[in-house]
Interface confidence: low
Amino acid sequence: FERTRSLQDPCSNCPAGTFCDNNRNQICSPCPPNSFSSAGGQRTCDICRQCKGVFRTRKECSSTSNAECDCTPGFHCLGAGCSMCEQDCKQGQELTKKGCKDCCFGTFNDQKRGICRPWTNCSLDGKSVLVNGTKERDVVCGPSPADLSPGASSVTPPAPAREPGHSPQ
């Protein structure tokens, strides 16, 4: 079958890193500079991705594989294959249309990306707050009040008065 296919289609003999050049009687020509073909038998080479601006090159393009980009410091990748770079914020902040904003009281973000999320409501699990939450850290829930030894006390924070993901403008 392979031999028959080769006779029918001379392009099938062209290896990765080349293309089947219709303008030159279907001979296998090397991919031009800044292009690649990752499989044999290609009729064109794909132009290499260029990691410019906020993108930086993680892996150089070769004749057989595309370049791979990541983001410059202060930014992180979004989308398949790092198709976008988004600005980092500090822990305790979230990115809004107006830039990085501190998390509202009752919410936290322990990463440089993503949105502020509400503190865990310990009482929903019948537990008490062992360590208060901050803008950067969730609360730490402890044993239920009934399990506490006599004389021990717990701190219960007020419930956050907002939806997750919103920041003061």
């Epitope: 499989a39 038998g41 794909d46 991705r49 595309n66 398949a80 294959g81 198709s83």
Partner: nanobody
Framework: EVQLLESGGGEVQPGGSLRLSCAAS????????MAWFRQAPGKEREFIGR????????DYVESVKGRFTISRDNPKNTLYLQMSSLRAEDTAVYYC???????????????????WGQGTLVTVKP
């Protein structure tokens, strides 16, 4: 006139399978790379996978590797997406797209593709 027409969508339970088809007409189907994308409500169009013109090179997004398989039948001018072990998060409108001969964009970005079908809805729910 270049046309792409998807079919095969529908409702399926989690863990189930579906096979989508994309019928192409109006151009030399066998000369172009093809891809599948999907778009869930309120989200951006997401690359699923791409198949070179001769089926010799495939690229898949990580979340579908091992579950989805793209294939093509050049004589029939048809692209396929075999989906198995479907999950609720796979619910979306699925689109096929034709790859440009040359593109300055990564193959996983929509700008790399010049013609699109109208989409077929896949719903995964218990």
């Amino acid at each position: 006139e270049v046309q792409l027409l998807e079919s095969g969508g529908g409702e399926v339970q989690p863990g189930g399978s579906l096979r989508l088809s994309c019928a192409a007409s109006g151009w030399a189907f066998g000369n172009y790379g093809m891809a599948w994308f999907r778009q869930a409500p309120g989200k951006e169009r997401e690359f699923i996978g791409r198949l070179a013109w001769n089926g010799g090179s495939t690229d898949y997004v990580e979340s579908v590797k091992g579950r989805f398989t793209i294939s093509r039948d050049n004589p029939k001018n048809t692209l396929y997406l075999q989906m198995s072990s479907l999950r609720a998060e796979d619910t979306a409108v699925y689109y096929c797209a034709r790859q440009r001969s040359y593109s300055r964009y990564d193959i996983r970005t929509p700008q790399t593709y010049d013609y699109w079908g109208q989409g077929t809805l896949v719903t995964v729910k218990p």
